[in-house]
Interface confidence: medium
């Protein structure tokens, strides 16, 4: 889970080791701050949990692409 140190900077120290289905994801944000030990993606899930993921993993990249497309194509 993400950890806020000296808010507003939020850092990830561990990544999830389980793929999360895109059907359970609501949004994401990238963590690129030099104050954090590693680059990360924080997914927000449909049940409001925030999960740290490794941006180098393919499923993470695919999930971000999927969420980007959802934003670009609003539901009628």
């Amino acid at each position: 889970q993400p950890d806020a140190i000296n808010a507003p900077v939020t850092c990830c120290y561990n990544f999830t080791n389980r793929k999360i289905s895109v059907q359970r994801l609501a949004s994401y944000r990238r963590i690129t701050s030099s104050k954090c030990p590693k680059e990360a993606v924080i997914f927000k899930t449909i049940v409001a949990k925030e999960i740290c993921a490794d941006p180098k993993q393919k499923w993470v990249q695919d999930s971000m692409d999927h969420l980007d497309k959802q934003i670009q194509t609003p539901k009628p």
Epitope: S21, R24, V47, K49
Partner: antibody, heavy 119, light 108 residues
Amino acid sequence: QVELVQSGAEVKKPGSSVKVSCKASGGTFSSYGISWVRQAPGQGLEWMGAINPLAGHTHYAQKFQGRVTITADESTSTAYMELSSLRSEDTAVYYCARYDGIYGELDFWGQGTLVTVSS
Amino acid sequence: DIVLTQSPATLSLSPGERATLSCRASQSVSDAYLAWYQQKPGQAPRLLIYDASSRATGVPARFSGSGSGTDFTLTISSLEPEDFAVYYCHQYIFYPNTFGQGTKVEIK
């Protein structure tokens, strides 16, 4: 260690309601969901519905829609399942089970509550 | 709703034999969100496998799961006396969640 403790056996008349409780200990209650699953005598498992306290979501199987209400009280770490308009076919063991809201496998189960519907 | 069909309904085997249980879904279970449970008489079900192939904590290595999409398998490599029970598959990608009807593994 996570433990789910359910209320005791009930005998009910047809047409009445039953409310089964499921008290959780050993985990962060609001971070998890609770599913309710029933098992009629000699039959398989049947998913009834679920609640995710963190998001306030409830989901019900269509078969039970309108007859079942699942609630949760975070202050006591207790989930409840109320089934109304009982009929003899509702005689079953009712289980609560915990799931992680992100995923969904049922990793911890209550001991079960036998509900007998008989006139 | 996703219908899960388990086969066979009953499997009669001897201790030490290999058990192969099948679970077929009526539509794809995305991201392999499928679990297997073991249930013994008078007891609550116990989680064995989640995400189709990951063993739950404390589950012996003789239990393994495989499959994706619509076809899933639970394998018990060498049956121990305590493995004779009913096994259920469960999909948790969609609401409503659904269970298979169960496979009973009995002593031959």
